[in-house]
């Protein structure tokens, strides 16, 4: 899923208020819902008919520092006999997400949002039939 | 996938620098990679063996204002005959993502990151067999 562009009004104050200095805003350091629990079904990446692996990328100047990317293991999908069936296709499911980028210039530290495309997992699809010309 | 807690050092300046006022930081208003293109396989939500629907939630004080959640359509998976097979399970693939929350207090506007749990799509898995005792 794609994140739309940020509207030019999102960072502005209400019309009745004095304008904000161009280019930067106040970011509170706490994170809302930081402790929320994620409950994912167990080991779905290996139990899926379109299984995937994970690769971790690390960047200390990004929050979250760790971004995990999935890669589909197969071209096809795993059938009931545990064999790859290329009459079906494993395809990635992707999500645009936001991360927070930390920028240093000497003792000046600022932050900026960054869009990152994350492959979250894979699903098994019926291929679109292409008739040979 | 779960986003870890933000480290207490992430918002701090280097040790040799004067400390930052507690609680808020400078957020640049531009977004890095705002124009990147997302290419998702075509209509995978309806062609998947574990198909899903989308529901959109809208909040004008959040960026992105629109957050799309997937819901698996079936308990089982769709077989080659187009019928639901409950010997397999459709399960959601979830991803913790960050959004930016806008907070008003009169003419004072500040921003805060918020964790949101997004269901991105569904995948078909072999169920875990529970033996009756």
């Amino acid at each position: 899923r794609k994140i739309p562009k940020v509207g030019h009004t999102f960072f502005q104050k209400p019309e009745s208020c004095p304008p904000v200095p161009e280019g930067s805003m106040k970011l509170d350091t706490g994170i809302i819902n930081e402790n929320q629990r994620v409950s994912m079904s167990r080991n779905i990446e290996s139990r899926s008919t379109s299984p995937w692996n994970y690769t971790v990328t690390w960047d200390p100047n990004r929050y979250p520092s760790e971004v995990v990317q999935a890669q589909c293991k197969h071209l096809g999908c795993i059938n009931a006999q545990g064999k790859e069936d290329i009459s079906m296709n494993s395809v990635p499911i992707q999500q645009e997400t936001l991360v927070l980028r930390r920028k240093h210039q000497g003792c000046s530290v600022s932050f900026q949002l960054e869009k990152v495309l994350v492959t979250v997992g894979c699903t098994c699809v019926t291929p679109v039939v292409h008739h040979v010309q | 996938r779960k986003i870890p807690k933000v480290g207490h050092t992430f918002f701090q300046k280097p040790e040799s620098c004067p400390p930052v006022p507690e609680g808020s930081m400078k957020l640049d208003t531009g977004i890095i990679n705002e124009n990147q293109r997302v290419s998702m396989s075509r209509n995978i939500e309806s062609r998947s063996t574990s198909p899903w629907n989308y529901t959109v939630t809208w909040d004008p004080n959040r960026y992105p204002s629109e957050v799309v959640q997937a819901q698996c359509k079936h308990l089982g998976c769709i077989n080659a005959q187009g019928k639901e097979d409950i010997s397999m399970n459709s399960v959601p693939i979830q991803q913790e993502t960050l959004v930016l929350r806008r907070k008003h207090q009169g003419c004072s506007v500040s921003f805060q990151l918020e964790k949101v749990l997004v269901t991105v799509g569904c995948t078909c898995v072999t169920p875990v067999v529970h033996h009756v005792q």
Epitope: C72, K73, H74, P127 | R42
Partner: nanobody, 123 residues
Framework: DVQLVESGGGLVQPGGSLRLSCAAS????????VGWFRQAPGKEREFIGA????????YYAVSEKGRFTISRDNSKNTLYLQMNSLRPEDTAVYYC????????????????WGQGTLVTVSS
């Protein structure tokens, strides 16, 4: 977007070997199925084979099985085609291609293509 640039083509003698590379730029190379096609002079573009995002699943067109080996290195964003026991009939422009779905790639309907690299097998 994904940009693909092939390299490694050239003139080789019959019975010789060649390794083609395809460098991809783009943030999520590992989420793509990638593969190779070739087009001989005056002929249709022909599918050679493809490899899954993780590199664990490889599919070859029957005619090329054994002589050609496809591999990928996601840490380098690169796809490879190792060609052995080359014959004059292998002379063609070789194209690297990428898509998120094997079904599209296999039938030449990929979203992304390189510009091709020429391989000439001749004594």
């Amino acid at each position: 977007d994904v940009q693909l640039v092939e390299s490694g083509g050239g003139l080789v003698q019959p019975g010789g070997s060649l390794r083609l590379s395809c460098a991809a730029s783009g943030r999520t190379f590992s989420s793509y199925v990638v593969g190779w096609f070739r087009q001989a002079p005056g002929k249709e573009r022909e599918f050679i084979g493809a490899i899954s995002g993780s590199g664990e699943s490889i599919y070859y067109a029957v005619s090329e099985k054994g002589r050609f080996t496809i591999s990928r290195d996601n840490s380098k964003n690169t796809l490879y085609l190792q060609m052995n026991s080359l014959r004059p009939e292998d002379t063609a422009v070789y194209y690297c291609t990428a898509d998120q779905e094997f079904g599209y790639l296999r039938f030449g309907r990929s979203e992304y293509w390189g510009q091709g690299t020429l391989v000439t097998v001749s004594s």
